[in-house]
Each structure stands twice: as structure tokens, then as C-alpha cells.
Amino acid sequence: SIPWNLERITPPRYRADEYQPPDGGSLVEVYLLDTSIQSDHREIEGRVMVTDFENVPEEDGTRFHRQASKCDSHGTHLAGVVSGRDAGVAKGASMRSLRVLNCQGKGTVSGTLIGLEFIRKSQLVQPVGPLVVLLPLAGGYSRVLNAACQRLARAGVVLVTAAGNFRDDACLYSPASAPEVITVGATNAQDQPVTLGTLGTNFGRCVDLFAPGEDIIGASSDCSTCFVSQSGTSQAAAHVAGIAAMMLSAEPELTLAELRQRLIHFSAKDVINEAWFPEDQRVLTPNLVAALPPSTHGAGWQLFCRTVWSAHSGPTRMATAIARCAPDEELLSCSSFSRSGKRRGERMEAQGGKLVCRAHNAFGGEGVYAIARCCLLPQANCSVHTAPPAEASMGTRVHCHQQGHVLTGCSSHWEVEDLGTHKPPVLRPRGQPNQCVGHREASIHASCCHAPGLECKVKEHGIPAPQGQVTVACEEGWTLTGCSALPGTSHVLGAYAVDNTCVVRSRDVSTTGSTSEEAVTAVAICCRSRHLAQASQELQ
Amino acid sequence: QEDEDGDYEELVLALRSEEDGLAEAPEHGTTATFHRCAKDPWRLPGTYVVVLKEETHLSQSERTARRLQAQAARRGYLTKILHVFHGLLPGFLVKMSGDLLELALKLPHVDYIEEDSSVFAQ
């Protein structure tokens, strides 16, 4: 019967008595930077070309005995997970292996850099179809390794890496912390994060998604027909590299940004038990388990968005945090979150010709996060309209006044330390969907976009007194682009998007002694693109 | 995932006012920085990736590497250029004493220097 991990990533329509989804990634080449591999293992023979690249440190210890099967173990298994005949994800993908890890599974940042450079030079000498680079390794945070990954990604290569097996924040490791890399954590058959001895999968905002990574059956270097079960974030990353190969084989023109958005979109949502993660990391860690798309084509009509969290600002009075979208993505909204509730909101601002989301800490606050909603919106023209604090009136308002521009997100930023001490009622006029409304002492920022066929609507859900969390979701066919809270008073900790749901967090009424006039409303802006939908229908 | 992220150490070695002879002074006001792995057991002191500014050509990378070797030799230090990078990042990999870091950070075109470190199969 089909191994659990292949079943988990397979949409129901492909599940027969065996795993054989259409097109096994045959147009794609997957580079594997790992140990040496047994390339003539029955599972992978003819699928893996061993390059002559080798850059590894000496093995530790004077009595180290180099046993071929041990030297090849890690790489052979991963090659099998990516493209193995019987237990592989992308059975049609061809692979090239580079040896950057020694027989003890140890390598160097410099050796990995030289390997990445080798791939880039190979790509220039002999351009082929789409390239996926699998990096099933991790070291401490490395500016240079992250920079090299960024350059390779900007050259059109998809990089997939292991989040790390240290039960720690993936942002402390490289290449896991590189924004351009698709970073993969590991889950088990019960959709629990994988425990590995006393440690386990890494987590946090630098993880893009999770994938099967425990008891994964794959090629064993012990013999040419042997299989073995291995666990780790390397195995998880290999699944995503395989899925990426299949997606790129079906749609070779996909950019890295489009591929990442699709991986997120087609993932199983909210199936991971978050209690395993440290409390402060739960909100930052994506609750996504990778899966193949239900059909290899036809996803183009959707408006894809993802949530990007910034690093923590730190606690100083003027501290700020910045969340950025990828180069091909549009920032459609910006929100902020602080565990202490002491924050001074957020704003969208231009930086290097691109909009970024900046959140502001407040005096006495433990720090803030900026949360960007990053979307794929072809031919978009977006701008930010700002209204300064209204002071005397009921509230500050700003709307999208340009013809054909629609509101995709609202942000508010204030200079006063605590809006909670100024409590005028905030009225939200009905029938004006293109308008952002906020506190009279806050400046309000509206993200206004023009794109072919783009339409948006506002959805609200309010509760009389704060109960920790208010949510509002966009319905089927619509995509959440903006998430904010009304009003911006002190008991609101912030707002953020989780998949297609806008979450507004606030302090419990029991701890704040709030009154019912402090009703908290979650405001979602839901958009869709008629243009993308029509283009997709014309293709079919 | 941010580049400015990470619990890693950044040591900025201040440039001395006196120049080193051969080396042209770096652009005014820019200070090359030194980075090393925050996890001590994973550090590999003695091998360094010297990363040069983005538009640096291969010939300039090679010239900078030779210059470092010459200046190190004058101080009685042996250095070995292990690899010259081009194609992804401009720079070079050098085996040298950590005593030479201050000197290396003053070289023209240098953006930052990172001490080599270990990576592991996951």
C-alpha cells in the first residue's frame, strides 16, 4: 500500500491503490547538495547524475572508518524521496548530485557556496528547463550563505531547504533564514511536528511550510534494492522539492513567487497541533502541510496571497519592525501585533522603490511585529493614500479616490503612547467600501490598487467586548488581502491574516476591566480578480 | 525570513587612520564588517570568505586577493587563496590567521568578511 507520506501529499483524486499523479516532474532538473550517493541504487538509477563536484571537510576523529554505505546514506535516501521509482514524489524528475557533506554528514559554508556557484555556472553554460536546488543541510546564521541563495534565486532557480532539526527558531540557521529560499519543517503521520531525540523540527516565521518528515521510506545505501526509514527536515524538504518539480513540470514558466504562493495555497491548513511549538512562536509558525495541487493546471485564476511576519522589533521606545514582500509580489496591506498591546500601529512606506510594512513599538512595550500581506497581482498599480490625524472630528478617514482603484488594506499609525486613554466612539460609515476609518489621533493609510478585473469588498465581525480573539473570513472564491481592527484602542494587541481569515487579538475583558463601548471589530478586505478568472477560462 | 535577522555576531573592526601602503582607502564612511557563527562549536577559524562589493569584477577580486597576500607576507604571515568566487558573489576564500582580519577589512572593494563555519545534514 501507498506509504503514509505519499498519501499525505496526494490529493484524493489521485489516490488509487498506488501513487501515480500525472507528470512526474520530467521537465525539471533537481540539484541535490548532500553526501555522496549510490547512484545505481534500483530506486534512482538513471535518474541521478553524479557531478564531479566535491568540496567536503575531513572526517573528525583519528579512528574514523570510511564505509561507503554510511557515506552515501543521507544523500541516497533523499534522492529516493525526491524521484525514486517506487517511493519517490516526482518519479519523472532527473537529479544531479553535488557532494558538499562528508561521510559524517558535515560540510562547510564555504563548500556549500562553491557548490551553489557551480550550479550557477552550469546553468549559464547549458541552460535547461526549470531548476530546483535542494539544500538538506543547516548551519548557524550565515550572511554570505543567505546572500548566495538570494542571488541564485534571482537567477530563476528555486531553492528548497531543511528548516533544521534543532527544535529552535529557524531564523537562527542558514540557509533556512534566507527569505528567497523555501524553508520546510517536518511533521509526522499524525500531523504533529516531528520530535527527533531531545530535539525536533525547527519552527517560526522563517519556515514557509511543513511536509512529511518522520519514518519516511526511501532508498537505502546498504544494498542496491534496500529501503530504509529516515526522519528529519531534510526528508520534509525533499518532499517539497519533489512537489515543486511536479508543479514546474506542469507550468514551467512559474516564477519563484508564484511557486511559493501555490505551495502555500494547496497545503493542508490548520492540521498541525501548535501546542508543540513554544508559545511565543505559535502565531509566527505557518500551520501548513505541503500537498500536490488537485490538478496540475487551472490555478492561475486565483488571487494568491500569503502572510509575511517581520523579525521582532525589540523593546526600545522607537523600535520598529519591517516586513517585506518578495520582488514579484505586491504589498496589499500591513498590520502589526504586540504581545503587550503597547504599539503605535503600522504604516506602508516606500523603501528602495518598493512598499514595505513598518510597525512601531510604544514606550513600555516589549516589541512589535509587522505583518505584510503579500499577493500576486499581475499588472497591478498600487499606492498608499494617507490621512493625518483628524484631531477634532469623530475619526480619521481616507479613501481610494483614483478612478478604478480599489481598497485592499488599511493601516493606522499614531504618535500618542496610548490611544486607549482617548476613547471617542469610532463610527464606520456604511456603503463606503473604499474607505479606511480609524482613531482621530491616528494617521490612516489606505492601500489602493488598480489591476485588471480586481474587485474587493469589506467584511466585518464585531463582538461587544473583547474576548481574546475576533475573526472574520473571506468566503470561497475570495482572497483575504487586508486585515485590521476597529477601533485601535489599547486592548487590541493587533491584527494578522491566517490563510483566508482575519484575526484580531485583544486582551481579555476580565483582565482589562473594559466596557462594552470598547467593542472590537475584525475588518477583512476580500478581493478577487475577474481578469484572472476569465483568462483561466479562455485557456480551458 | 529577513536578511537583517539572526542571532549571529557582527564585529565591526574600526579602520585605523594610517593607511597600509598599497591599499587604496575604502570609500569614505563605509566600514567593512566581520561576521562569525554564533554557535561556537560550529566555527572554523582560520578560513574566511571575503565578500566584495556587488559590482566587483573577477579581475578586481583576484587583485584584492593578491594584495591581501602581499600585505600579509610583509607582516610575516602566510596566506592561501583557496577559491575565487564569481558568478554568484564576488569575493574569495582565504586561509589565514585571524590576526589579519583588521588588515583584510581595510582592503578596497571589501563589503564584509565571514568566518567559515560548519553545516550539517538534517
Epitope: 549510490q38 538513471g46 553524479v50 521509482r85 518519479k91 542496491s224 | -
Partner: antibody
Framework: QVQLVQSGAEVKKPGASVKVSCKAS????????ISWVRQAPGQGLEWMGW????????NYAQKFQGRVTMTTDTSTSTAYMELRSLRSDDTAVYYC????????WGQGTTVTVSS | QSALTQPASVFGSPGQSITISCTGT?????????VSWYQQHPGKAPKRMIY???NRPSGVSNRFSGSKSGNTASLTISGLQAEDEADYYC?????????FGGGTKLTVL
Amino acid sequence: QVQLVQSGAEVKKPGASVKVSCKASGYSFTSYGISWVRQAPGQGLEWMGWVSAYNGNTNYAQKFQGRVTMTTDTSTSTAYMELRSLRSDDTAVYYCARGYVMDVWGQGTTVTVSS
Amino acid sequence: QSALTQPASVFGSPGQSITISCTGTSSDVGAYNSVSWYQQHPGKAPKRMIYEVSNRPSGVSNRFSGSKSGNTASLTISGLQAEDEADYYCSSYTSTNMVFGGGTKLTVL
């Protein structure tokens, strides 16, 4: 193009040994093993075993265990199959094929065992 | 390792379709995707026609197709032509080895 070229026909006495060679060209020799398959006159195909061109490991069919030795020489991209203690029922055409996938075959070597 | 079971002979007229079955067990055909089909003309080496159940190597006519259900694999040849007359063998991985079918002689009438 990918080719496997085998050595010429052999006539052997019962109890003797035969060593058949198979020279590979047109691909990376160590990326595949070599399978050996035989076919007795008027009979079907019979898989004898496999040898790794990467590390020399072997996987023999139980029937030939102890009587067959398969080796490779990566310097010449050549695989060898030696069958010992020959009997008359070992008379067959012996084929080498690329890997377990057996996507490319040699032209065959006829081995006749006769007293 | 006992051979996979194939019919000894199959007959078909030009233009017709024929199917050759290959029955194994849950330890070979049923367990692996790696079922191949070979064509052998008299005095010639076998030629791979289908691999991994249903994939056709480049250069092989699309008249040849493969499938699998449970422990039985099948080779279908549509639009029979005179040059299709040959012996056909299936093969499958087993947990440690390879196993062939006994062979099927296809006669084009």
C-alpha cells in the same frame, strides 16, 4: 549513443568456467549497474544478477549464488560475468543489460557447454 | 523466484488490438511500479517497449501501452502490424531481485 558490446561466442567443457565481458559506452558508467540475463535455446529470459559499477556490490539470483561472480572495471567501463562449474544446461545466450531498468541490451554472447 | 505468469501465445489480425497479461503476486507486480515489457524478435536481443507500468521509451510506437491493476500488469498493442510478431516478456522488481514472465508468442495472422 548508449551501447553495450559483448565478447564473442565461447565453447566450454562441463566443469570449466567462462568469463563474458560487456563494454559500455555513451553514458556515465557509474550511474547504472549492469544486469546479466540468460536465455537457453527456445526458453525464456532468466535474470542472473546485477553488479554495481559505482562500488562493485553485487546482487545475485539465488539459483546462481556461489557459482557466479560479477565484477566491473571502471577504468575501461567494462563489466564481467564469470560462471563456474559449467553444466550442459548452462548452454545459453548471455546478455548484459544496463542497470535494473534494463533499458539497453548487449548483442548477446553464446556460450555452449559440451563435452 | 518463480516466473510471472503470461499466456504462452496470443493471436491477432492486422489492425486489431490485443492484450497480454502478466500475473504476479503482492510481492512483485503488486508491490512495485517497476513493471517493464520487452519485445524480442528471433535471434535478436530484447528491446524495452514499456517501463514503469505505463511509460513508453522514446522511439516506441504509441500503439504500445501498459497498465496495471493489483497483481496483474497488461500490455496492449493496438492497430496490430506484421512487424509486431515477436516474443513479449514482462519483468518486475521483487524485494531483492528481478523476475521475468515466461514469455508470450504473438502471432499476427
